[in-house]
């Protein structure tokens, strides 16, 4: 008799794929544009990335450090009108893209939460949550919560409003902290909170350290849903050398939880390569004309247009990973088991019941390595086969779809492999 199928977990929409942050509308659209109407025209691009949610803004009225000219219910006229916002929501809904609104109050100022009385601001946030929920947003993000006194209790109140409206609404909190204890204390009192932090930002370039960070985090958070990013707002290139971008994309898309990216992460957008551009929000490179300041500074392979035409580009990898992440049960909600594969390597299995299983092997080092996969570390339910099919490699040159002998697995410097194998009873 066939074994019984394992009961599927309840899946919220943010469990099914990546979130895409557009913190600066003007930088994202470029060419002096940068409003909600223009963003509506970019939704097809977001659809092509197969992201599930757009984390937008902040876009509310905020004069730097001035509570008397900050209004969480009013859209800054530079970004458009409430009608433009409603229209964006409708279009996004049609494309199955959820919209999460960033309500960090003093986003143009020194202290995101002002240095004054917290109660008043927090009470106003409650009214703003209600207002925007009724307007149709799918969730909220608040950043820099380390600057918010009594953050845990305020987050719990805001979570109550968000969830009280609908269980299908999401609250994301962001912190600059990379300290696990601080992160856990924020998560403790807030069951469904998605927290973005700098926890992984100092993972360095060793597989062992990354493995240790990831497993510590997963063990500490138990069975709660995680999010994976390198910071609450910044680009991957702020933390990583170019050669590790593909590796991290593969890792973020295949760890158990929601991957969260910033606009430009999919093309390796790097402010350092664009003189005069702000580190936190460089102009998005749609094509070679996106950065006219210095002629010739932008080559085709740095742009969306150029990378879209190249199947070996970072953007193409992002799209493939995003597609896999959103349709494979083992990646959607499968169990996670990390195991030893030798120094410099981080490897893990994702598996769900009798569905196709995935093996991820990541070489963080700058030398080629043979993987010594220690299957003995794995529980019986997650045993390794002798061979697995190569779904994709972060490096060009490997024949995809071909079976690889796991005992003889060799990885190039900075290479990541995603392999698949069937369930065997």
């Amino acid at each position: 008799r066939a074994p019984r199928c394992r009961e599927l977990p309840a899946q919220k929409w943010w469990h099914t794929g990546a979130l895409y942050r557009i913190g600066d509308l003007q930088a994202f659209q470029g060419h002096g544009a940068g409003n909600l109407a223009g963003l509506k025209g970019r939704l097809d691009y977001l659809s092509s990335l197969k992201v599930k949610g757009l984390v937008l803004g902040p876009i509310h009225k905020n004069q730097k450090d001035d509570v008397a000219q900050t209004d969480l219910l009013q859209i800054d006229p530079n970004f458009g009108s409430k009608e433009d916002f409603d229209s964006l929501l409708q279009s996004a809904k049609k494309k199955s893209i959820r919209v999460i609104l960033d309500l960090t109050p003093n986003y143009r100022g020194e202290n995101s939460w002002f240095s004054t009385q917290v109660d008043t601001v927090a009470t106003k946030v409650k009214d703003a949550l209600e207002f925007w929920l009724q307007a149709g947003v799918d969730g909220f993000q608040v950043r820099d919560i380390e600057n918010l006194k009594d953050a845990s209790s305020f987050l719990a109140e805001w979570q109550n409003i968000t969830k009280g409206f609908s269980e299908d609404r999401l609250l994301i909190a962001g912190t600059n902290s990379s300290d696990l204890q601080q992160i856990l204390s924020l998560l403790e009192s807030n069951k469904d909170l998605l927290l973005t932090s700098s926890y992984l930002s100092d993972s360095g370039s060793t597989g062992e350290h990354t493995k240790s960070l990831v497993t510590q985090y997963l063990n500490a958070t138990g069975n709660r849903w995680c999010s994976w990013s390198l910071s609450q707002a910044r680009l991957l290139t702020s933390f990583l050398p170019a050669q590790l971008l593909r590796l991290y994309q593969l890792m973020l898309f295949t760890l158990p939880g929601t991957p969260v990216f910033s606009y430009g992460d999919e093309i390796g957008l790097d402010a350092a390569a664009l003189p005069g551009q702000p580190m936190e929000a460089p102009v998005m490179l749609w094509d070679e004309s996106s950065f006219p300041d210095i002629p010739g500074a932008v080559s085709a392979n740095m742009t969306v247009k150029g990378q879209s035409e190249d199947p070996g580009s970072l953007l193409s990898l992002f799209r493939r990973l995003s597609d896999q992440r959103s349709k494979e049960r083992s990646l959607l909600h499968g169990d996670f088991h990390a195991f030893s594969a030798g120094p410099g390597l981080f490897s893990y299995i994702r598996h769900w019941d009798q569905n196709e299983r995935f093996l991820v092997v990541l070489n963080f080092g700058d030398v080629g390595l043979s993987a010594g996969l220690q299957a003995s570390d794995l529980p019986a339910s997650a045993s390794l086969p002798a061979k697995a099919d190569l779904l994709l490699s972060t490096q060009p040159g490997r024949e995809e779809g071909s079976p690889l002998e796991l005992e003889r697995l060799k990885l190039e410097p900075h290479e990541g492999l995603l392999l698949r194998f069937p369930y065997a009873a």
Epitope: V67, T70, D119, T120, K126, E130, I161
Partner: antibody, heavy 120, light 107 residues
Framework: DVQLVESGGGLVQPGGSRKLSCAAS????????MHWVRQAPEKGLEWVAY????????YYADTVKGRFTISRDNPKNTLFLQMTSLRSEDTAMYYC?????????????WGQGTTLTVSS | DIQMTQTTSSLSASLGDRVTISCRAS??????LNWYQQKPDGTVKLLIY???RLHSGVPSRFSGSGSGTDYSLTISNLEQEDIATYFC?????????FGGGTKLEIK
């Protein structure tokens, strides 16, 4: 022009009930939080209750908690204050006031008030 | 609850005078201080919010200042229509609380 007009005041016996109304016009009512503030004869102003635009967030002064209920009907642009177990100390002029949407909280527009007298 | 105190309950001044009304909070209210004018007929209007910001339509002879726990309202050139009672109010925490009021009269 923002306009707030209160009604429903009058003479009520102690222990009785009364419902005050406030008709709003000149602004998008559902966007704004609304307050009731009262003033006893020859006394200062006292905040009574607050309700957010969509009725999710409601707060009361300790002196009225459990006896008064604030509510609103957004399609009808009307704010209410249901008062029960009335006492002589509830005798006052009752004002409805609009809460600014700015983070610098204030009552930016007020009605002209309606008088409630609690007496036997 | 935060107590708001207006030590002067009534004040006489001549037309054209510069008048200052003060208000003290029982704790730091971080500039979340508003001033209201109540005319003899009972109508109430917001004059100044967040310590010093003039509400729309309010004449520029009204100004506000202060910080921490001490705040004041100044009328630079008293006019007949300014005869009223002035209340301060803190917006720092719930419950919102008012001062007892300062009644301004003409000498």
């Amino acid at each position: 022009d923002v306009q707030l007009v209160e009604s429903g005041g009058g003479l009520v016996q102690p222990g009785g009930s009364r419902k005050l109304s406030c008709a709003a016009s000149g602004f998008t009512f559902s966007t704004f939080g609304m307050h009731w503030v009262r003033q006893a004869p020859e006394k200062g102003l006292e905040w009574v209750a607050y309700i957010s635009g969509g009725s999710t967030n409601i707060y009361y002064a300790d002196t009225v908690k459990g006896r008064f209920t604030i509510s609103r009907d957004n399609p009808k642009n009307t704010l209410f204050l249901q008062m029960t177990s009335l006492r002589s100390e509830d005798t006052a002029m009752y004002y409805c006031a609009r809460e600014t949407t700015l983070l610098a909280t204030n009552f930016d527009y007020w009605g002209q008030g309606t008088t409630l007298t609690v007496s036997s | 609850d935060i107590q708001m105190t207006q030590t002067t309950s009534s004040l006489s001044a001549s037309l054209g005078d510069r008048v200052t009304i003060s208000c003290r909070a029982s704790q730091d209210i971080s500039n979340y201080l508003n001033w209201y004018q109540q005319k003899p007929d009972g109508t109430v209007k917001l004059l100044i919010y967040y310590t010093s910001r003039l509400h729309s339509g309010v004449p520029s002879r009204f100004s506000g200042s202060g910080s921490g726990t001490d705040y004041s309202l100044t009328i630079s050139n008293l006019e007949q229509e300014d005869i009223a009672t002035y209340f301060c109010q803190q917006g720092s925490t719930l419950p919102r609380t008012f001062g007892g009021g300062t009644k301004l009269e003409i000498k």
